[in-house]
Interface confidence: low
């Protein structure tokens, strides 16, 4: 009897959706996988007879649940399916955005990157999929714990009047309203304002 | 539909234990992870612990703040993973979900989320 694989999840991030699993313990030899998706009732092969222990599915309609598939083989022997269901609209990770920061006196100036889809067209972002898009900003005082939050209404922001010759750190996330869904954060940004360059009167 | 009921919360003194129940209904493989999140008041929901099964004994996995302390278990033939919390802090108090396909514990992605218990950990 072969054994079915182990610890079988979807990594979905950002519409990039591997199965993946673990190989289980067999004594008679290397074991080899197949993974399928329910299409129109019917099962269909997306990994046949694979070594690996991921199969990628990023191909899947990002809408509806999807019922996928994977087994252990050996020779003319093979284990139990083991399935799960994915809905990649709602169960994907939202990725960090990508983030611009420059300093202007005593000012940061923000632009923000919604993060790319795997297999869709060069300019396709998580933004073109979710109607509500928006972005949430953090930024603190480097060494400090204290953060601010804020969420900018388009796609760049200034952080005005800050402390003069101070670090400030920022990170950027999305988040989706209608869904009360948020995103990884973006790695934190530091940079030094300069001078205050408001003229004394 | 999977459905996911956790039980098991309550108030508790700091350094005191806690076991978190959470049944899982519909369909669930034994093969796929099945764990904890938590959410406390103002923050950010957190991963806590996953499982899996394992023809080899049981593949956990558990954030830093916790690990020594929490257990995570599981029992297939009763569609049930449990979390066995030692040594509680105040920091513990939130309230705990169960979901399904949570093994990247550092995003709150997953598949299927329970309604939550609340744990409160008081000093």
């Known amino acids: 009897m072969v054994p079915p694989p182990e610890n079988v999840r979807m990594n979905s991030v950002n519409f990039k959706n591997i199965l993946q699993w673990e190989s289980p313990a067999f004594a008679k030899g290397n074991l080899t996988f197949t993974a399928q998706y329910l299409s129109y009732r019917i099962f269909q092969d997306k990994c046949m007879n694979t070594t690996l222990t991921e199969c990628d599915f990023s191909s899947l309609s990002k809408y509806g649940d999807h019922t996928l598939r994977v087994r252990a083989e050996f020779a003319d022997e093979h284990s139990d399916w083991v399935n799960i269901t994915f809905c990649p609209v709602d169960d994907t990770i939202i990725g960090p955005p990508g983030m611009q920061v420059e300093v202007l006196a005593d000012s940061l100036h923000m632009r923000f990157l919604a993060p790319k889809i795997e297999n869709e067209y060069e300019t396709w972002t998580m933004k073109n999929v979710y109607n509500s898009w928006t972005y949430n900003v953090q930024y603190w005082k480097n060494g400090t714990d204290e953060k601010f939050q804020i969420t900018p209404q388009y796609d760049f922001e200034v952080l005005r009047n800050l402390e003069p010759w101070t670090t400030y750190c920022v990170q950027v996330r999305g988040f989706l309203p209608d869904r009360n869904k948020a995103g990884e954060w973006s790695e934190p940004v530091c940079e030094q304002t300069t001078h205050d360059e408001t003229v004394p009167s | 539909q999977v459905q996911l009921v956790e039980s098991g919360g309550g108030l508790v003194q700091s350094g005191g234990s806690l076991r978190l129940s959470c049944v899982a209904s519909?369909?669930?493989?034994?093969?796929?992870?099945i764990g904890w999140f938590r959410q406390a008041p103002g923050k950010e929901r957190e991963g806590v612990a996953c499982?899996?099964?394992?023809?080899?004994?049981?593949?956990?996995n558990y954030i830093d703040s916790v690990r020594g302390r929490f257990t995570i278990s599981r029992d297939n033939a009763k569609n049930t993973v449990y979390l066995q919390m030692n040594k509680l802090k105040p920091d513990d108090t939130a309230i705990y979900y169960c979901?399904?396909?949570?093994?990247?514990?550092?995003?709150?992605?997953?598949?299927?989320w329970g309604q939550g218990t609340q744990v409160t950990v008081s000093s």
């Open positions: 979901a399904t396909n949570c093994w990247r514990l550092t995003s709150p992605a997953a598949d299927n």
């Open positions: 499982i899996s099964s394992s023809g080899r004994g049981v593949n956990a």
């Open positions: 519909g369909f669930t493989s034994p093969y796929s992870t």
